[in-house]
């Protein structure tokens, strides 16, 4: 039988807003990844910032509802925004436990679907809600 969905939880320092209220944090100790049990969905998300071929995780946690993409078994990120010149935010949604721990691959920043120069711009740390 299914369990309540459990996702990796992470919020980079300086990120504005929190998705902590979308679940209940499990007491996992220090060495293990932080885990959150989703309250309102069966869907995890992840956001990575790709700058000069280096991907840095910005946020991981529970989505506030089940929506397209949540049926995915794995985290397959797609480009969403350019928070600053030379960096691209990639987000994924997926619907298995801890599926947001890692991404399967990141498409190149210039691939189809990437917002162009007219796409949304934001200061670092303010881009997250656009991505969600």
């Amino acid at each position: 039988p299914p369990n309540r969905r459990t996702c990796v939880f992470f919020e980079a320092p300086g990120v504005r807003g929190s998705t902590k209220t979308l679940g209940e944090l499990l007491d996992t100790g220090t060495e293990l990844p932080r885990a959150i049990r989703c309250l309102y969905s069966r869907c995890c998300f992840g956001i990575w910032n790709l700058t000069q071929d280096r991907a840095q995780v910005e946020m991981q946690g529970c989505r506030d509802s089940d929506e397209p993409g949540c049926e995915s078994l794995h985290c397959d990120p797609s480009p969403r925004a350019h928070p600053s010149p030379g960096s691209t935010l990639f987000t994924c949604s997926c619907g298995t436990d801890f599926c947001n721990a890692n991404y399967s691959h990141l498409p190149p920043p210039g691939s189809p679907g990437t917002p162009g120069s007219q796409g949304p711009q934001a200061a670092p740390g303010e881009s997250i809600w656009m991505a969600l």
Epitope: T6, L26, T28, S41, R42, T96
Partner: antibody, heavy 113, light 112 residues
Framework: QVQLVQSGAEVVKPGASVKMSCKAS????????VSWVKQSPGQGLEWIGE????????NFNEKFKGKATLTVDKSTSTAYMELRRLRSDDTAVFYC??????WGQGVLVTVSS | DVVMTQSPLSLPVTLGQPASISCRSS???????????LEWYLQRPGQSPRLLIY???NRFSGVPDRFIGSGSGTDFTLKISRVEAEDVGVYYC?????????FGAGTKLEIK
């Protein structure tokens, strides 16, 4: 087919520890939570906690924190539960389950001096 | 902790007759994701528990269709349309909506 095979019965003295195993086969071990359940003699069932083998994250019934430790060995698809500081009221059958759908045969732990 | 109250605690039934077991929870078992994490198990004498029903009404693979789960919120029922000899044992309801997960005290079904 899915199988969970647990280790044999144990007789232990009060204050001692015991570690039991639960070997899984017939499915991808890292994709399902392993839960542990206690059944005291002639009593009902009590949920102890669960562990996700892929990353070792566990979730406990507060009552069993400090009493039970859950671990896994991914290389052998085996889950373990260690019970420490055993008392007579820890005498019970302990079951492992694959996310509650398939169950092991149980391990009888008898705490007696 | 969420208390799961089963009734009756003992259920003598004639073979071929229907049987019904009630389970009430002290809090609603509908979770924020819309799913109700309510399950039913049968423990035959000398055996491990066996999953019958999950998500209130979904039969687990291999479970005969004479087992029917229903209910919502705090009130749940397991019905057996025609009791067979192999149905003897203790039936437990279980909730995985709230931590800690909890079982009912069990209902012992026996043949009259």
């Amino acid at each position: 087919q899915v199988q969970l095979v647990q280790s044999g019965a144990e007789v232990v003295k009060p204050g001692a520890s015991v570690k039991m195993s639960c070997k899984a086969s017939g499915y991808t071990f890292t994709d399902y939570w392993v839960s542990w359940v206690k059944q005291s003699p002639g009593q009902g069932l009590e949920w102890i906690g669960e562990i996700y083998p892929k990353n070792g994250v566990s979730n406990f019934n507060e009552k069993f924190k400090g009493k039970a430790t859950l671990t896994v060995d991914k290389s052998t698809s085996t889950a373990y539960m260690e019970l420490r500081r055993l008392r007579s009221d820890d005498t019970a059958v302990f079951y492992c389950t694959r996310q509650r759908d398939y169950w092991g045969q149980g391990v009888l732990v008898t705490v007696s001096s | 902790d969420v208390v799961m109250t089963q009734s009756p605690l003992s259920l003598p039934v004639t073979l071929g007759q229907p049987a019904s077991i009630s389970c009430r929870s002290s809090q609603s078992l509908e979770y924020g994701d819309g799913y109700t994490y309510l399950e039913w198990y049968l423990q035959r004498p000398g055996q491990s528990p066996r999953l019958l029903i999950y998500g209130v009404s979904n039969r687990f693979s291999g479970v005969p269709d004479r087992f029917i789960g229903s209910g919502s919120g705090t009130d749940f029922t397991l019905k057996i349309s025609r009791v067979e000899a192999e149905d003897v044992g203790v039936y437990y309801c279980f909730q995985a909506t709230h931590d800690p997960n909890t079982f009912g005290a069990g209902t012992k079904l026996e043949i009259k």
